[in-house]
């Protein structure tokens, strides 16, 4: 389903506010129809999407979302100002950075504006719902004849993240995994010069600043080592170019950059 963002034009039904602030959420006259679950994720603490399955409604319904924080200074109910739509029906809400307070209890309420007492409310700990961007700028340094060091960057959240490095050779059937703490560097002490290695990394907002369960996407992979016959000839050219970059630009120290950056370098 295609999802678009739209800012409401102000012609919102204001009756919902009355019910929201004066009516208990349950009474015997309330419809027994369940509301879809709202799932929220905070992307790199830059914005948050709270979404629901709009197609679970028996008939197309523009459900409305309100939210607030349990906060001494300001616990006012806020209306969603940027709805997400699926097939012209509300299916989510996007909150911007200034509206995100990771360490206050976030409360989100979904409501049927045609039947305002049909509402469902839940509390969320946003620090457990952060998903960082994938690690970037993977680089490999040869520390010694047989030792490699992998480094990477994360946008903004460095000390809050833990990482998972996966690597394999072209002879391996599966990845080898290694957990890495917030220092975002990984050493492979014993490298076989006859093999071609592939590395990738993902990150998670855990455990220093939150307890998120969700990992970022995997980084673009980075490669090291011998060429093999099964590889794409274009990659051979890129690798040859990499070697030139590392020897000329880095004074002989070998350093590889990620495929994304290589393609960028190749085309420019």
């Amino acid at each position: 389903l295609n999802t678009t963002i739209l800012t409401p034009n102000g012609n919102e039904d204001t009756t919902a506010d009355f019910f929201l602030t004066t009516m208990p959420t349950d009474s015997l006259s309330v419809s027994t129809l369940p509301l879809p679950e709202v799932q929220c994720f905070v992307f790199n603490v830059e914005y948050m999407n709270c979404t629901w399955n709009s197609s679970s409604e028996p008939q197309p319904t523009n459900l409305t979302l309100h939210y607030w924080y349990k906060n001494s200074d300001n616990d006012k109910v806020q209306k969603c100002s940027h709805y997400l739509f699926s097939e012209e029906i509300t299916s989510g809400c996007q909150l911007q950075k200034k509206e995100i307070h990771l360490y206050q209890t976030f409360v989100v309420q979904l409501q049927d504006p045609r039947e305002p007492r049909r509402q469902a409310t839940q509390m969320l700990k946003l620090q457990n719902l952060v998903i960082p961007w994938a690690p970037e700028n993977l680089t490999l340094h040869k520390l010694s004849e047989s030792q490699l060091e992998l480094n990477w960057n994360n946008r903004f959240l460095n000390h809050c993240l833990e990482h998972l490095v996966q690597y394999r050779t072209d002879w391996d059937h599966s990845w080898t995994e290694q957990s890495v703490d917030y220092r975002h560097k990984f050493s492979l002490p014993s490298v076989d010069g006859q093999k071609r290695y592939t590395f990738r990394v993902r990150s998670r907002f855990n455990p220093l600043c939150g307890s998120a369960q969700h990992w970022s996407e995997w980084s673009h992979p980075i490669h090291w080592g011998s060429n093999t016959s099964k590889e794409n000839p274009f990659l051979f050219a890129l690798e040859a170019e990499q070697k030139l970059i590392s020897e000329e630009d880095l004074g002989g120290e070998q350093k590889l950059i990620s495929e994304e950056d290589l393609h960028h370098h190749h085309h420019h």
């Epitope: 929201l20 602030t21 004066t22 009516m23 208990p24 959420t25 349950d26 015997l28 309330v30 419809s31 027994t32 129809l33 369940p34 509301l35 879809p36 679950e37 709202v38 799932q39 607030w68 349990k70 906060n71 001494s72 616990d75 006012k76 109910v77 209890t105 409360v107 309420q109 049909r118 509402q119 469902a120 409310t121 839940q122 509390m123 969320l124 700990k125």
Partner: antibody, heavy 121, light 108 residues
Framework: QVQLVESGGGVVKPGGSLRLSCAAS????????IHWVRQAPGKGLEWVAL????????YYADSVKGRFTISRDNSKNTLSLQMNSLRAEDTAVYYC??????????????WGRGTMVTVSS | DIQMTQSPSSLSASVGDRVTITCRAS??????LNWYQQKPGKAPKLLIY???SLQSGVPSRFSGSGSGTDFTLTISSLQPEDFATYYC??????????FGQGTRLEIK
């Protein structure tokens, strides 16, 4: 009739398991967050766990984390608490309680009668 | 976690008395404070929510006040059915939810 009814309590040895249930009726169960709260004999109230209305957000007291699992079946209007690795200090009456929101404020407006769990060798 | 401390732990009073129970939070909880009444062998019953709002069906002799860290539950004229244990509960930093240790109100 609006009510919550707990069941499944009993006597169990330390290290054992028990599964409590809470049957709801008379309100829109599927749109309500539900909690477990316990009370040791002669003691005060202790919050145990919360499950959100649709069931995917779950929170636990530190004292039960990793041992207890809260779940719900909205199609059957039932709540469960799976209790593993039970300890003597888990001995208590266990209540399920419905969360209600009035404006931005939440409280427990409905409680079951409780079910007694005794952990003893 | 936020700690809730009630005082007194127990008190004796007579029918018709005005009774005040206090509850103190270890940090500011705005008005996220509820009061419950529990009688022996029974489940708790909500009396006051949001520090001062009377739950539907609860007699008006019960009232709540306070904000921040200090809260009070007042029973203006004690009735025989009011002898019970009373608990405060914060819902500000939730979860976890925390209760006070309880105040047992006995007949003098």
């Amino acid at each position: 009739q609006v009510q919550l009814v707990e069941s499944g309590g009993g006597v169990v040895k330390p290290g054992g398991s028990l599964r409590l249930s809470c049957a709801a009726s008379g309100f829109t169960f599927s749109n309500s967050g539900i909690h477990w709260v316990r009370q040791a004999p002669g003691k005060g109230l202790e919050w145990v766990a919360l499950i959100s209305y649709a069931g995917s957000n779950k929170y636990y007291a530190d004292s039960v984390k990793g041992r207890f699992t809260i779940s719900r079946d909205n199609s059957k209007n039932t709540l469960s608490l799976q209790m593993n690795s039970l300890r003597a200090e888990d001995t208590a009456v266990y209540y399920c309680a419905k969360e209600v929101w009035t404006g931005t404020y939440d409280s427990f407006d409905m409680w079951g009668r409780g079910t007694m769990v005794t952990v003893s060798s | 976690d936020i700690q809730m401390t009630q005082s007194p732990s127990s008190l004796s009073a007579s029918v018709g008395d005005r009774v005040t129970i206090t509850c103190r939070a270890s940090q500011s909880i705005s008005s996220y404070l509820n009061w419950y009444q529990q009688k022996p062998g029974k489940a708790p019953k909500l009396l006051i929510y949001a520090a001062s709002s009377l739950q539907s069906g609860v007699p008006s002799r019960f009232s709540g006040s306070g904000s921040g860290t200090d809260f009070t539950l007042t029973i203006s004229s004690l009735q025989p059915e009011d002898f019970a244990t009373y608990y405060c509960q914060q819902s500000y930093s939730t979860p976890p939810i925390t209760f006070g240790q309880g105040t047992r109100l006995e007949i003098k």
